[in-house]
């Protein structure tokens, strides 16, 4: 029995739970998901029983080995998987636990602008990046392009201070999770600040 193995998969994709055994006479291998039996294998008997019929098409054993491949992943496949290898040659079953996290492929992140002010020719605002569907474990970073050196900023909120007359800047939000990344539409500082240009003391949402 080894330490818990953490696995990551994407919705619609596949994941393989690695399993090896040097036991000669394996009587049975039992896979469970959150305490519910998933598959029972009897290598000598040549039988593989998938407990729920709907999972039959999703279960495979690459290269005829003991590792279990689960495909067409869904969000609710996330959870704890457990395998026990039972053999008359073992005093107790050999076991392994896995934790699977299934993530969605990220859609394009949405950017909203906070309160904007324009004082002394400087446009000041916040840009907030977020996912419309509230996906989990998303990390946001901002890329600011166009100054002498390109800059990065961590976090979903980017504070902006852009002075009229400076070269235009482009802001892009990058959203990442363990299986994908996506980019917002680029936002130009000049366009963003145009609304406040006429009235040096204006503020808008």
């Amino acid at each position: 029995s080894g330490p818990v193995k953490e696995l990551v998969g994407s919705v619609g994709g596949a994941v393989t739970f690695p399993l090896k055994s040097k036991v000669k006479q394996v009587d049975s291998i039992v896979w469970t998901f959150n305490t519910t039996p998933l598959v029972t294998i009897q290598p000598e008997g040549g039988t593989i029983i998938v407990t729920q019929n709907r999972n039959r098409e999703r279960v495979d054993f690459p290269d005829g080995g003991y590792s279990l491949k689960l495909s067409k992943l869904k969000k609710n496949d996330s959870g704890i998987y457990y395998v026990g290898i039972y053999s008359s040659s073992l005093q107790q079953p050999s076991t392994q636990e896995y934790v699977l996290h299934v993530y969605e492929h990220l859609s394009k992140p949405k950017v909203t602008m906070g309160l904007q002010s324009n004082k002394n020719g400087t446009c000041v605002t916040n840009l907030t990046c977020c996912m419309e569907h509230g996906e989990e474990d998303v990390i946001y970073t901002w890329k600011a392009l166009g100054q002498a050196a390109n800059e990065s900023h961590n976090g979903s909120i980017l504070p902006i201070s852009w002075r009229w007359g400076e070269s235009d800047m482009t802001f892009i939000c990058v959203a990442r999770n363990p299986v994908s990344r996506n980019f917002s539409s680029p936002i130009l500082a000049r366009k963003l600040c145009e609304g406040a240009a006429d009235d040096p003391d204006s503020s808008m949402v």
Epitope: S21, K22, K24, I41, P43, E44, G45, G46, T47, I48, R56, F61, D63, G64, G65, Y66
Partner: antibody
């Protein structure tokens, strides 16, 4: 990648013996059953027996007990099948084939076959 | 020993055809049946094990089904490279394992 390479064709006289070898590579030889299967001209495939190289344990088809002897050498990852008291009906192509782990009776990798001809 | 009776012994078909081969075991073998493809002068190649599990790399036009005593191999749309002889084999519990005598799939 997994490979099973068998020894070359043999021509033997009735009553003689022959030893066919099967050299394995690309996997842990000692941890998988090795099967032997024969295919006589115009006949069905016949399972002869299998050996577990890790400890030399063997299982035979009753029809081939006393006819075939299976052995394995872990140091060279080679399996052997010896056929004794050869008769003309033993003329066949003999294959070694590795068992899958998940279903030990299913065979996923096969040697290229060794033709044994028994003729006076 | 368990007998495996395969039918038909040969069949003629065209590229694109759906082909079905059946195998009957003389006693219950649960789902412990494998299917192999063999081309002249070559070793058999594993297609399906445990009745319905496609071996790695086998195209999904090959499908195995059945349990108990009746088993089927279906090729959904025959391709030029599929013309060969197909064998069923029971791999249930204690050996000996036994094979069907083959179905030769020929070009019509």
């Amino acid at each position: 990648q997994v490979q099973l390479v068998q020894s070359g064709a043999e021509v033997k006289k009735p009553g003689a013996s022959v030893k066919v070898s099967c050299k394995a590579s690309g996997y842990t030889f000692s941890s998988s059953w090795m099967n032997w299967v024969r295919q006589a001209p115009g006949q069905c495939l016949e399972w002869i027996g299998r050996i577990y190289p890790g400890d030399g344990d063997t299982k035979y088809n009753g029809k081939f007990k006393g006819k075939a002897t299976l052995t394995a050498d872990k140091s060279t990852s080679t399996a052997y099948m010896e056929l004794s008291s050869l008769r003309s009906e033993d003329t066949a192509v003999y294959y070694c084939a590795r068992s899958t782990m998940i279903a030990t009776g299913a065979m996923d990798y096969w040697g290229q076959g060794t033709l044994v001809t028994v003729s006076s | 020993d368990i007998q495996m009776t395969q039918s038909p012994s040969s069949l003629s078909a065209s590229v694109g055809d759906r082909v079905t081969i059946t195998c009957k075991a003389s006693q219950d073998v649960s789902t412990a049946v494998a299917w192999y493809q063999q081309k002249p002068g070559k070793a058999p190649k594993l297609l399906i094990y445990s009745a319905s599990y496609r071996y790695t790399g086998v195209p999904d036009r090959f499908t195995g089904s059945g349990s108990g005593t009746d088993f089927t191999l279906t090729i959904s749309s025959l391709q030029p490279e599929d013309f060969a002889t197909y064998y069923c084999q029971q791999h249930y519990s204690t050996p000996p394992y036994t094979f069907g005598c083959g179905t030769k799939v020929e070009i019509k």
